[in-house]
Amino acid sequence: LIQERRSHEVNPAAHLTGANSSLTGSGGPLLWETQLGLAFLRGLSYHDGALVVTKAGYYYIYSKVQLGGVGCPLGLASTITHGLYKRTPRYPEELELLVSQQSPCGRATSSSRVWWDSSFLGGVVHLEAGEKVVVRVLDERLVRLRDGTRSYFGAFMV
Amino acid sequence: LIQERRSHEVNPAAHLTGANSSLTGSGGPLLWETQLGLAFLRGLSYHDGALVVTKAGYYYIYSKVQLGGVGCPLGLASTITHGLYKRTPRYPEELELLVSQQSPCGRATSSSRVWWDSSFLGGVVHLEAGEKVVVRVLDERLVRLRDGTRSYFGAFMV
Amino acid sequence: LIQERRSHEVNPAAHLTGANSSLTGSGGPLLWETQLGLAFLRGLSYHDGALVVTKAGYYYIYSKVQLGGVGCPLGLASTITHGLYKRTPRYPEELELLVSQQSPCGRATSSSRVWWDSSFLGGVVHLEAGEKVVVRVLDERLVRLRDGTRSYFGAFMV
């Protein structure tokens, strides 16, 4: 897996931002803004929530999600799982790449208390051309979107 | 926004560290150590808390702040906002780039006395020459400084 | 400390993952998987928990650890310290590079409550050839390992 960084080539990078349409409630991955505001794609493409690799190599991939709620009502998961997952044509299921579990709801000591928490993930993974990376949050009802600065997803080749 | 990485050029990077003078209490951004210990500037400059871009491009910018306190009295901020903000000559106000909100004080149970929390932000943004990036924390009274390893601010071109 | 990125050279990078053998209980640093699954070494080597630098330069180093427990048993530290430390032949003691302190146990409001928390660290440091970077967690008994996706350690040259 020798990888060279050519001086005349653009280094692939992307930063995608949270938007009102990010949370589908369908059980699928989060969706992202790719063009407006701070969002961009350079040497990577996007499809249905996924960053799609066009050039094989090692990538630092990252995501942050803003979590929040009022109190801790029954029925809401006490554990939040936030992860980056790979989809590859060579394997039928998504593969976990980087995952965090948090119990932010436990911070609220009374039923009316507003709480906030943030989960950040980042790490280097090898990705082949055509492979896709997505973000999932379970329970996504606790993800708080606003203006693209609090929940986001990105990558760059290293 | 095609960006080339020339093989003969130094890749801009910086890592600034927290110091006793970081917290001004003035409502301004946090200030940073730029030379001593782990701190350095390479192809970026510094002014009044800001990393100043000399070469336009995409940068991975990051910051971590160490939060801590004793007990959780009413009157101390229940929500902490930690963010990276851009100042540009083309716009009069700071622009939010990456932001987190946390409720760390809720971690202190009725008996647990001292609480600690950490907030990490990182992401890729496009910055033009002359633009500046700063770190803000509200309520900054809860930021815990020690030796530059717990609260810091950095960037590198990708 | 002028550093050039040669176009014909492979850029050093590594991502090491948590494994059943990571937690030694010996007071030493965490140990890591270097080959299986998502783990790899490219232009860096590994020895006894340490990433070993072969080429001097500025590196973005990072680590995430997954913390978790059931309630907050007596005898467990209420403060968790997660850090990246440098070992250099020029100095007898480890040097703190990036450190976080958290009080995750305070999130559990009842003695039987399961809680999860995650700690992420990342930042740019200068490393000389032969220097080593390790990860330490105190109290490591609260680190939760599973499949290499929740606790990890990596670096790449910037």
Partner: antibody, heavy 122, light 107 residues
Framework: QVQLQESGPGLVKPSGTLSLTCAVS?????????WNWVRQPPGKGLEWIGE???????NCNPSLKSRVTISVDKSKNQFSLKMNSVTAADTAVYYC???????????????WGQGTTVTVSS | DIQMTQSPSSLSASVGDRVSITCQAS??????LNWYQQKPGKAPKLLIY???NLETGVPSRFSGSGSGTDFTFTISSLQPEDIATYYC?????????FGGGTKVEIK
């Protein structure tokens, strides 16, 4: 430099209420510090009673909680202790003391009043 | 409540001697421990905070060490003015609790 001064009756009848006030001078009670009460029975060690923050948030020793009320008066820059249903076992020197800052992470009791002796007797 | 066990309860030493007092917590309290000096008829005085940090203005012959459950307070060279009772105090958990005290006397 902050100074603390306790005041209140030196003698309280059994089953009565002990009332003490601590005046803060040289600084504001509205700082981020916690303000504490500690007592010391004759010839014995120190016992923490409780604390208050300027916003009114309080914490008390569970062994005394049902009998103790701590309050703050920001306009007078003082805080107070009330303990009801006292017995001879509550005879002690009572100290007011400044604790660590809520916006801080150490909790040394760094400023103390000179103490006031309260005797519970009929 | 966290129990703080101090030993010895009293000691007698000569001027110039090195004196050590230990404090053991009933559970891990990290470094959340303070040491106080109380002279007869006076209020306690904070000497050491966070297990090992010297309060401003306190002579350097006083020191503290330890973490977790076991802590030590040391006077490197006992002076006549050091005659007092010394207390440890934890603040890892509420209620704040003190050790039983160690009375230091001059031989």
């Amino acid at each position: 430099q902050v100074q603390l001064q306790e005041s209140g009756p030196g003698l309280v009848k059994p089953s009565g209420t002990l009332s003490l006030t601590c005046a803060v001078s040289g600084g504001s009670i509205s700082s981020t510090h916690w303000w504490n009460w500690v007592r010391q029975p004759p010839g014995k060690g120190l016992e923490w009673i409780g604390e208050i923050y300027h916003s009114g948030s309080t914490n008390c020793n569970p062994s005394l909680k049902s009998r103790v009320t701590i309050s703050v008066d920001k306009s007078k820059n003082q805080f107070s202790l009330k303990m009801n249903s006292v017995t001879a076992a509550d005879t002690a020197v009572y100290y007011c003391t400044r604790g660590g800052a809520a916006a801080g992470t150490n909790y040394g009791l760094d400023v103390w009043g000179q103490g006031t002796t309260v005797t519970v007797s009929s | 409540d966290i129990q703080m066990t101090q030993s010895p309860s009293s000691l007698s030493a000569s001027v110039g001697d090195r004196v050590s007092i230990t404090c053991q917590a009933s559970q891990d309290i990290s470094n959340y421990l303070n040491w106080y000096q109380q002279k007869p008829g006076k209020a306690p005085k904070l000497l050491i905070y966070d297990a090992s940090n010297l309060e401003t203005g306190v002579p350097s012959r006083f020191s503290g060490s330890g973490s977790g459950t076991d802590f030590t307070f040391t006077i490197s060279s006992l002076q006549p003015e050091d005659i007092a009772t010394y207390y440890c105090q934890q603040y890892d958990n509420l209620p704040l609790t003190f050790g039983g005290g160690t009375k230091v006397e001059i031989k």
